[in-house]
């Protein structure tokens, strides 16, 4: 008789999750010499230990501490790029501007990017059928708690001028409920972070509006200013040209507004 299994509203653990995490870890440590000391088997064991045999709606940041410790990584604190709802462009940017880092350019972010995982209470099984959805089931699920934990630490580590890429095509350019709006903004350290500079990425070719005047950007400005961090905002009217100019800053067309 098949054992009863909890049905959750979200997709199940990504296929070949253990193999994927291990392979990503090996690849990352080969590419990044400063992380060559990392033992990927230990990293997987710590990752697994955070959620296996635990109720997938009762995961805490504490569960991830062994993994956080193993994945400790120093990134230049003044080279951090945050993003919200525009991951692909942010990643394209850091692939070109190699001295800047998104969370997914760090070991822990790279390991988990685009993956889903959860376990079951009191069994050592990984649940490949379904995992809790943040809205419909519970917020303290393995994936959400992981991203909350690593995002908080990433924001806490930032200094000087921190950049954030925001999607100007969305109805809420700044969304208080996003990871950026609910976690990262509130964990920037005012004694270390001088300025948060928002880059609002335009979607339409002919969109010449100043999206820095959007009410949600004003809301972000207010939150940041209350924390005694300076705020700055730039419109990126042409993201394609923006990336091109990052690649070739000497190009004569790159002096005009992008």
């Amino acid at each position: 008789v098949p054992r009863w299994r909890q049905q959750w509203s979200g997709p199940g653990t990504t296929k070949r999750f253990p193999e994927t995490v291990l392979a990503r870890c090996v690849k990352y440590t080969e590419i990044h010499p400063e992380m060559r000391h990392v033992d990927c088997q230990s990293v997987w064991d710590a990752f697994k230990g955070a959620f296996i045999s635990k109720h997938p709606c009762n995961i805490t940041e504490e569960d991830y501490q062994p993994l956080m410790k193993l994945g400790t990584q120093t990134v230049p604190c003044n080279k951090i790029l945050l993003w919200s709802r525009i991951k692909d462009l942010a990643h394209q940017f850091t692939q070109v501007q190699r001295d800047m880092f998104t969370l997914e350019d760090t070991l822990l972010g790279y390991l988990a990017d685009d993956l889903t995982w959860c376990g079951e209470f009191n069994t050592s099984k990984i649940n490949y059928q379904s995992c809790p959805d943040w809205r419909k089931d519970c917020s303290n699920n393995p994936v959400s708690v992981f991203w909350k934990t690593v995002s908080r630490r990433f924001a806490e580590a930032a200094c000087d001028v921190v950049h954030v890429m925001l999607n100007g095509s969305r109805s809420k350019i700044f969304d208080k409920n996003s990871t950026f709006g609910s976690v990262e903004v509130h964990n920037l350290q005012p004694e270390k972070v001088q300025t948060l500079e928002a880059w609002v990425i335009h979607g339409g070719r002919e969109d010449s509006r100043d999206l820095c005047q959007d009410p949600t950007i004003k809301e972000l400005e207010s939150i940041i200013s209350k924390r005694n961090i300076q705020f700055s905002c730039k419109n990126i009217y042409r993201p394609d040209k923006f990336l091109q100019c990052v690649k070739n800053p000497e190009d004569s067309s790159c002096t005009s507004e992008i």
């Epitope: 004694e191 270390k192 500079e197 005694n228």
Partner: antibody, heavy 116, light 111 residues
Amino acid sequence: QIQLVQSGSELKKPGASVKVSCKASGYNLTNYGMNWVRQAPGQGLEWMGWINTYTGEPTYADDFKGRFVFSLDTSVSTAYLQISSLKAEDTAVYYCARYPGWFAYWGQGTLVTVSS
Amino acid sequence: DIVLTQSPASLAVSPGQRATITCRTSESVDSYGNSFMHWYQQKPGQPPKLLIYRASNLESGVPARFSGSGSRTDFTLTINPVEANDTANYYCQQSNEDPWTFGQGTKVEIK
């Protein structure tokens, strides 16, 4: 290029007030906070505090709460330091210095002498 | 407040030799692997000039003869080789914790 240009030397009597200016050029003043640093004759450097040039909110180190006021006039890209009820021990060179927490850009300094 | 103690208070070095200044802090100035310790050079009648930021990063335009190292509570500024125009006062400064604080300074003279 980025420059911070301060007002000239001042000779003041005890009890008077002085206002030192720091004009920023080569960048947008409101993008970076402005710090003030004091150096008494033959002495080391003391951080007095900073002003958030975006919101205008000042932060003072404990030893500089009370008689010291940081202010701004963004229309002329200038930060100000005002000292009231001057005392002989306020005699020093006062520097403005641009953020971040390490100061890559400094004004040339303003010597304030308090003497009767 | 974090107290910064520099040593020595002064030193005399011959041109071509190495000068080493240390700065010890009363508590760690590290955060997530970054050390918030900075070094300045000040010549008479001039404002301080940033040499090294965050313990080991050479400020743009500063000669590679200057280098910084250290972490947590112990930091070093090295000038190697020393040149005649390196005569100046040198200060360390932390920005890990408000209020920012400076060391008392080290006077470097060239023999």
